[in-house]
Amino acid sequence: EKPASSLNVRFDARTMNLTWDCQENTTFSRCFLTDKKGRVVEPRVTNKECSCTFREICLHGGVTFEVHVNTSQRTFQEKLLYPNSGREGTAAQNFSCFIYNVDFMNCTWARGPKAPRDVQYFLYIQNSKRRREIQCPYYIEDSGTHVGCHLGNLSGLTSRNYFLVNGTSQEIGIQFFDSLLDTKKIERFNPPGNVTVRCNTTHCLVRWKQPRTYQKLSYLDFQYQLDVHRKNMQPGTENLPINVSGDLENRYNFPSSEPRAKHAVKIRAADVRILNWSSWSEAAEFGSDERHHHHHH
């Protein structure tokens, strides 16, 4: 049976809804999106519905939507090309975001190389369930063009979020850029806090506090590096950092016998699955300045 193309497929990028004309006595419906990388995304669709909603998709590379509908009489298959209309090279580029200090996020981008002088960009963010849209509340500008965004309230975000940079110009059509970003990948941790060192005659015990994070993480999700070094060391005598897994009580005990020279300990943190290291904590010092033999640990 020859497939007929009369479904009148249409797509609303704001809601990520693909709709088509309902067919009588539908027995089976499927919808797909295929991108240039060969990735296929297929949402759930029930036979009673004549639409499907996409969630985790990016559109800026140009995509093809496809709908298959079987009825008791015939088969329908229809494709809809969804190109990124506008002049090539006008979209925002080098887009990136990072979450810092738990509650803040900065996103930055560069103007497209073919973008006209009057181009203006606008950032919209939706959580991955597409249930809430945030418009950038505070833009960072370069010669009047928006090239970044600062957010001081991340309450609407989820573990994965959709970022859309639209562009406008009086001269030509501007292409859009969109991206799905995991908060796991973009959060920069603060360094560990409350770093303390206590020593007895043979050992020193370092303790620290797990940094507060935007994501809900357990102690198992943290990896730490400790840099224990002698103060006033010769340049070029670098210590290898000590790797310590997160624990309910973050501590590291190491041999260091008295008398001990003055040392400093600093610590940094990362997500175990990502290893994007935080900056180093303030150094905690131990030992004394008096000149005596140094026990190497």
């Epitope: 990388k37 990735r39 995304v41 297929e42 969630r55 985790e56 699955r273």
Partner: antibody
């Protein structure tokens, strides 16, 4: 502790279909993304796709389009992989897998695996 | 897609020896790399994620290192139960891809 338990081995003829199940315990299905990885005899591991049981979205490679369907039954916490129009090259061990941090397109490491289901396609 | 290439294909060593397995990505995957162990008739088991962090319950004789395109799994002192096939897998780019495996066998 989370466990994934898969259905038993299947022998199918070319052109037929097969449906492999993956029962989750220790978590509810809607909290997870379930991925399917296959391993042909004596070969390496190949990611097939991922499925979000909460909203039903599936993510897979174009070469599987039209032959692969991933579904889930949230009432029984069971995920399913259905393969249609089977060919001899579909003979493989099929694993369901998930992790502590997953979406439909990847996991930050597959922490948990089913024991595997051997599907043999032979005339 | 990112191609992961493991070497050597087979490594023959004796218990007590040190094993070094390599994995190279066709483009940078940052630290988004996992290592798995698979024994005959069993499912793969996650050993390492984030290129160097050991998964829960993995003995400390297993260690991972590297970032970008070159990664190493080291087993400091081989135990009889360590002889298996080892796979690396990147999760930086879609689709997630595995290496072809390194078989670690008893000499």
């Amino acid at each position: 502790q989370m466990q994934l338990v898969q259905s038993g081995a299947e022998v199918k003829k070319p052109g037929a279909s097969v449906k492999v199940s993956c029962k989750v315990s220790g978590h509810t299905l809607t909290e997870l993304s379930i991925h399917w990885v296959r391993q042909a005899p004596g070969k390496g591991l190949e990611w097939m796709g991922g499925f979000d049981p909460e909203d039903g979205e599936t993510n897979y490679a174009q070469k599987s389009q039209g032959r692969v369907t991933m579904t889930g039954d949230t009432s029984t916490d069971t995920a399913y992989l259905e393969l249609s129009s089977l060919r001899s090259e579909d003979t493989a061990l099929y694993y369901c897998a998930t992790g502590r941090y997953c979406s439909t397109d990847t996991c930050y490491g597959f922490d948990y695996w089913g024991q595997g289901t051997l599907v043999t396609v032979s005339s | 897609e990112i191609v992961m290439t493991q070497s050597p294909a087979t490594l023959s060593l004796s218990p007590g020896e040190r094993a070094t397995l390599s994995c190279r990505a066709s483009q940078s995957v940052s630290s988004y790399l996992a290592w798995y162990q698979q024994k005959p008739g069993q499912a793969p088991r996650l050993l390492i994620y984030g290129a160097s962090s050991r998964a829960t319950g993995i003995p400390d004789r297993f260690s991972g290192s590297g970032s970008g395109t070159d990664f190493t799994l080291t087993i400091s002192r081989l135990e009889p139960e360590d002889f298996a096939v080892y796979y690396c897998q990147q999760y930086n780019n879609w689709p997630p891809t595995f290496g072809q495996g390194t078989k670690l066998e008893i000499k």
